[in-house]
């Protein structure tokens, strides 16, 4: 095979174009200049290279950049990104959100791969915190992202980023994660008026303390039962019957259907029967 290592006459690639799809792997290796490839990476995606040919192109870039690719190359990797290993990606320094978006787009519709997870971790660590634009981007591609972070990692999320969080992004969060996110949301939305504030804070209320629930009960918020059932039991227990009635508004009738479930069950057991009777729902303490 040694005689094939030199580029045949007239085959040296002056640019990255469609003609290269007819090159054998050894010809790509011998005839494509790595520096040229790096400057014309944006063209690679438009050319229907085979997986084997992409392997050769990756190898050329690896030789040119043994310490890791520069961001100018990373941003234009396109489908070549799918050939990268987590070990490759750990060598990168990705700082541009546009680069992150471009690579997440390549993986769109697929489950998060180890490569993507490594890329995201590198990007977030490089930024030092999960800023709003980053969180916006990550949750758009992966709605469950926030709930896979530990409470400690979530503590580095600035309150301003909470504006990027949608209710569905919190669907799989556990109570300890909500304990961390709720105070940030409260701070983020503090300047909104009553009804608008409640709409925004609602999905974070699984982390709310008793005093905040008491305050909400004074604002005619009409909390639905689904939200009430997600509240912390220890936060609900001290509420009076009158406060729960104000908090739920017309939804208070739903307590009957949930009387055997926490936190309703535990709350009922804490109330005086006379007070429960004022609701007219037949709740038995």
């Amino acid at each position: 095979e040694v005689e094939k290592t030199a580029c045949p006459s007239g085959k040296k690639a002056p640019e990255i174009d469609e003609s290269l799809i007819f090159y054998k792997k050894w010809e790509l290796e011998a005839c494509v200049d790595a520096a040229l490839l790096a400057t014309q990476m944006d063209r690679v995606n438009a050319i229907p290279f085979t997986y084997e040919q992409l392997d050769v192109l990756k190898h050329k870039l690896d030789e040119l950049y043994p310490q890791g690719y520069p961001e100018s190359v990373i941003q234009h990797l396109g489908y070549l990104f799918l050939k990268m290993s987590p070990e490759d990606i750990r060598k990168w320094n990705v700082t541009s959100l546009e680069t992150l978006k471009a690579l997440l787009e390549v993986n769109k519709g697929h489950e998060m791969s180890p490569q993507v997870a490594t890329l995201i971790d590198r990007f977030v660590k490089g930024r030092g915190q999960l800023d709003k634009d980053t969180l916006d981007t990550l949750t758009a591609f992966y709605p469950g992202y926030l709930c896979s972070l530990s409470p400690e990692e979530l503590s580095s999320v600035p309150p301003s980023s909470i504006w990027a969080v949608r209710p569905q992004d919190l669907d799989t969060c556990d109570p300890r994660q909500l304990d961390v996110l709720y105070p940030k949301a409260r701070l983020a939305f503090q300047n909104m008026n009553g009804s608008e504030y409640f709409v925004k804070i609602q999905s974070f209320l699984g982390g709310a303390p008793t005093e905040d629930l008491k305050a909400l009960s004074q604002q005619n918020v009409s909390m639905d039962l689904a939200t009430f059932m997600k509240l912390r039991t220890d936060a609900v227990l001290p509420l009076t019957v009158a406060e729960v009635q104000k908090l739920l508004g017309p939804h208070v009738e739903g307590l009957k259907a949930e009387e055997r479930h926490r936190p309703v069950r535990d709350w009922i057991l804490r109330q005086r029967q006379d007070d429960l009777d004022t609701l007219g729902l037949g709740l038995q303490g």
């Epitope: 180890p114 490594t118 971790d121 469950g144 896979s148 400690e152």
Partner: nanobody
Amino acid sequence: QLQLVESGGGLVQPGGSHRLSCAVSVSTFTRYAMRWYRQAPGKEREWLTSIYSDGSSAYADSVKDRFTISLDNAKNMLYLQMNSLKPEDTAVYYCNANVDSKAYWGQGTQVTVAS
């Protein structure tokens, strides 16, 4: 597609100890929150504990000093060590994984605490 399979359920004496296991079908995930939940008859599912990819863990107050969550990455196994068991711990126990931003559930394993 990731799959979770719990095992180790059974009958335990009050005051006794027991360990549940959850086999995780893949090991290539990078970012995760692994959790244990339980559901007693006629009650809603209750979160018990979580372990996260940074190695930290969290517990519900009801089990804080009695239950311990652990993950053996080499064996792809999640565990729940339960001590000082009480009759009110009787439930179906489920493992849950929020892995690389998707949520998965096991089928559950029954634990009955009775003498």
